[in-house]
């Protein structure tokens, strides 16, 4: 069966910086991932990016950067310039679209407990979209 | 006909600030992002950055960020784009354009807005 | 930030030849480019979008290929109103970055 999964991980040097990991387990190729915060995509969620593994990608703040880093693996850099750090109680969703298997989203925060540079253990919630 | 219909040219001094506009028709607003890209006399494009006229959401070359603004207006289906402390690095001809979310390109630009800074 | 490189700024060709315009990219960019023609004192108009896919209405003239890091626009059967200037575009990552475009003179 695929997997989603998420990491947070709080940058050490910079409380305000964040980063996403969302990787998918499974076969198949996968057509686009989709990277929300606040809650699933369409669901609640507000859109932080759109991957396309050939395509390239789009962004809306407070992404800073997004990029591929594997062919089943994305990572999201996020930058809040305020003195507060919003990110820190924030559910993080990631779904990927893949063929033939559908899509599957996963959603991840940072817990309370985690120092700075420590990234949370993968946290799937799989949620199966028949698209 | 699908067209992005600029505002026209400005003459502004060193230090003020300028809000162009971009108005849409022929076409679901909503269903597209605007970008806006840059083009210095004689010289090559940079891209700005771009607005989701649905949430607002925007994203922004950091070269730019602090120098433009970019919001929508949904009812009168316009992007805006304000630039802040000008100086004369800001003098171009500037034009927003439409990105089709689905193919990922820009498929149809505006007329342009040439903005001079000079005092 | 990615450097898209086109090494040609001018080039000159008479109507009816065929000249093909690159374009490199610093790094992979897949298939995430689009071509992009400038006509003197106009907007400009998109004629090929990731790599090698026509823009509507564009003439079977212009065609687009490449990937990974090397791209190319290659132009046949040249008509005086390819006069242009014609740039590259990727959007890979952010931000998205043009190539410095290359002066298409048509004797």
């Known amino acids: 069966t695929p997997e989603v999964w998420v990491q947070v991980q709080m940058e050490a040097t910079e409380l305000s910086s964040f980063t996403v990991h969302c990787g998918f387990l499974g076969p198949g190729s996968i057509s686009l991932v989709t990277v929300s915060w606040g809650g699933p995509d369409g669901a609640g969620g507000t859109k932080l990016a759109v991957l396309h593994p050939e395509l390239g990608t789009r962004q809306w703040a407070p992404a800073r950067q997004a990029r591929w880093e594997t062919q089943s693996s994305i990572s999201l850099a996020l930058e809040d310039s305020g003195a507060s750090s919003p990110f820190a109680n924030t559910t993080f969703c990631c779904k990927f679209a893949s063929f033939p298997e559908g899509s599957w989203e996963s959603c991840g925060s940072l817990p309370p407990s985690s120092d700075p540079g420590l990234s949370a253990p993968p946290t799937p919630v799989p949620i199966l979209r028949a698209d | 006909e699908v067209q992005l219909q600029q505002s026209g040219p400005e003459l502004v001094k060193p230090g003020s600030s300028v809000k162009i506009s971009c108005e849409a028709s022929g076409f679901t607003f909503a269903d597209y992002n605007v970008d806006w890209v840059k083009q210095s006399h004689g010289k090559s494009l940079e891209w700005i950055g771009a607005i989701n006229p649905n949430d607002g959401g925007t994203s922004y070359n950091q070269k730019f960020e602090g120098k433009a603004t970019l919001t929508v207006d949904k009812s009168s289906t316009t992007a805006y784009m304000e630039l802040r402390s000008l100086t004369s690095e800001d003098s171009a001809v500037y034009y927003c354009a439409r990105w089709v979310n689905n193919d990922w390109y820009f498929d149809v630009w505006g007329t342009g807005t040439t903005v001079t800074v000079s005092s | 930030d990615i450097v898209m490189t086109q090494s040609q700024k001018f080039m000159s060709t008479s109507v009816g030849d065929r000249v093909s315009i690159t374009c490199k990219a610093s790094?992979?960019?897949?298939?995430?480019v689009d071509w992009y023609q400038q006509k003197p004192g106009q907007s400009p108009k998109t004629l090929i979008h990731s790599a090698s896919n026509r823009h509507t209405g564009v003439p079977d003239r212009f065609t687009g290929s490449g990937s990974g890091t090397d791209f190319t626009l290659t132009i046949s059967n040249i008509q005086s109103e390819d006069l242009a200037d014609y740039f590259c575009l990727q959007h890979w990552n952010y931000p998205y970055t043009f190539g410095g475009g290359t002066k298409l003179e048509v004797k």
């Open positions: 790094q992979n960019v897949r298939s995430a």
